[in-house]
């Protein structure tokens, strides 16, 4: 795996442990937490940063309206199991014995049971809508600038194909993303769109996955684009199995049939 | 550290060009605006404008509008203002100060230059 | 524009003491920013986002407000804290400063 081989550490993940014990006594990176060698050429799987993360010491209507099958990360952190490529277990369980189904993104998309539940396959998460609010500029943005310079991010940090970023939409303050990426579009080699978001999740907290790198500065034609809020929906290509209660009273959307969280990201 | 170093005082005649350099060292350059501020004998702080080296983006104070050019060089990780049609009240300290901002925080104008005064006298 | 009026223009104090500088804005502002000038010094940012000390900034510099409404504090002045203090306001163009406030040695 290739990784910076003059200091011997993860551009793409300060969450490893490196050393130059790979063959020939190149740099070999592993992911906290899990020990599972990560590629350094491209992003780690979002399970195995979850999975590090929880092993870290503690300190005119242009947009889209979610739809009715929509998921928002509603349960925060959790420890997952990982499968040996990185990619999340179908079947997630806690230390209590309670378990639930999770979509390739490691979102939970049944009720939770116990150890009998089963969950025949990983749903794919084939869409991705993230909701993002700016703050205030002096100056405005203008759209096809806004446009390009997220596509150009998604390229360029995130190593995502142009192609699975489908629209970036826009109305003051918020602006809207969509990624799409279905199984049969997605070559060996591709970032996975559920991985890209996560890390573009963390940068807009102020909480950069990359090695040695300064937050985020995104500028459109020189303006900094500041987020105040961000919101994300991922849609599965089966629909989630929530019992009717939740869906008609348990979630926080009122009423609605999405599993509805808003992340204060600030 | 990161440091702006600005060219050495001038005197000019009314109606006349000044060009002021600014040299930024200690970060990469491209990533963060150039802001240039004037300071007048005995008055407060002005805003001129900012330059962003990494696209040449620029936004000027309409009140200096047609008068002031922000120019950058790269490859010297110089950013110039040149201000024409000099008049006596064109005397001042003229700052350029770089703006490091990240999606989360804007994060002022930090450090400046030392300075250039720029004196326009008959 | 956004006129910025910082009150008092000059304040008389005695090292020790706790200095309270305010900025008003002719329009509401989401952020203010606040420098510290010194004679023949360049400016010094001290506070970025109304109320994050810059780097480098002591503790007993902090700021607060919002709206139209900003306030720097010092809460013990120290002798190489006498200077002349400028609100700043990044909401809209042209960028703007306050006219100044200036601490000095009662």
């Known amino acids: 795996h290739t990784a910076a081989q003059d200091n011997c550490t993860c551009p793409t993940n300060k969450m490893t442990v490196c050393s130059p014990d790979g063959p020939g006594g190149r740099c070999q990176c592993r992911a906290l937490g899990s020990g599972v060698a990560v590629d350094c050429s491209t992003l780690t799987s979002k399970c195995l940063l979850l999975k590090a993360r929880m092993s870290a010491p503690k300190n005119a209507r242009t947009l889209v309206r979610p739809n009715e099958h929509a998921l928002v990360d509603n349960d925060g952190l959790y420890d997952p199991d990982c499968d040996p490529e990185g990619r999340f277990k179908a079947r997630q369980c806690n230390q209590t014995s309670v378990c639930w189904c999770v979509n390739s993104v490691g979102v939970r998309r049944t009720d939770k049971g116990d150890l009998s539940l089963r969950c025949d396959e990983l749903v794919r998460t084939h869409h991705i809508l993230i909701d993002l609010r700016h703050r205030p500029t002096a100056g405005a943005f203008n759209h096809s600038d806004l446009d390009a310079e997220l596509r150009r991010l998604f390229r360029e940090r995130y190593r995502l194909h142009p192609k699975f970023v489908a629209a970036v939409h826009y109305e003051q303050p918020t602006i809207q993303i969509e990624l799409r990426q279905n199984t049969s579009q997605k070559a060996a080699g591709d970032v996975d769109i559920g991985d890209a978001a996560y890390y573009f999740e963390r940068d807009v907290k102020g909480e950069s996955l990359f090695q040695g790198r300064g937050g985020l500065d995104l500028r459109v034609r020189g303006e900094p684009l500041q987020v105040e809020r961000t919101l994300i929906y991922y849609l599965d290509e089966i629909p989630p199995k929530f019992s009717m209660k939740r869906l008609t009273g348990g979630g926080s959307g009122g009423g609605s049939h999405h599993h509805h969280h808003h992340h204060h990201h600030h | 550290q990161v440091q702006l170093v600005q060219s050495g005082a001038e005197v000019k005649k009314p109606g006349a060009s000044v060009k002021v350099s600014c040299k930024a060292s200690?970060?990469?350059?491209?990533?963060?605006?150039i802001n240039w501020v004037r300071q007048r004998p005995g008055q407060g702080l002005e805003w001129m404008g900012w330059?962003?080296?990494?696209?040449?983006?620029?936004k000027y104070n309409e009140k200096f509008k047609g008068r002031v050019t922000m120019t950058v060089d790269t490859s010297t990780s110089t950013v110039y203002m040149e201000l024409s049609s000099l008049r006596s009240e064109d005397t001042a300290v003229y700052y350029c100060?770089?703006?490091?901002?990240?999606?989360?925080?804007?994060?002022?104008?930090?450090?400046w230059g030392q300075g250039t005064l720029v004196t326009v006298s008959s | 524009e956004i006129v910025l009026t910082q009150s008092p223009a000059t304040l008389s104090l005695s090292p020790g003491e706790r200095a309270t500088l305010s900025c008003s804005a002719s329009?509401?502002?989401?952020?203010i920013y606040w420098y510290q000038r010194k004679p023949g010094q360049a400016p010094r940012l001290l506070i970025y986002?109304?109320?994050n000390l810059a780097s480098g900034i002591p503790a007993r510099f902090s700021g607060s407000g919002s709206g139209t409404d900003f306030t720097l504090t010092i809460s013990s002045l120290e002798p190489e804290d006498f200077a002349v203090y400028y609100c700043?306001?990044?909401?809209?163009?042209?960028?703007?400063f306050g006219q100044g406030t200036k601490v000095e040695i009662k």
């Open positions: 100060a770089t703006r490091f901002a990240t999606v989360v925080s804007n994060y002022g104008l930090d450090p």
């Open positions: 200690g970060y990469t350059f491209t990533s963060s605006d």
């Open positions: 330059i962003y080296p990494r696209d040449g983006s620029k």
């Open positions: 329009s509401s502002v989401n952020y």
């Open positions: 986002d109304t109320s």
């Open positions: 700043q306001q990044w909401n809209s163009y042209p960028l703007t």
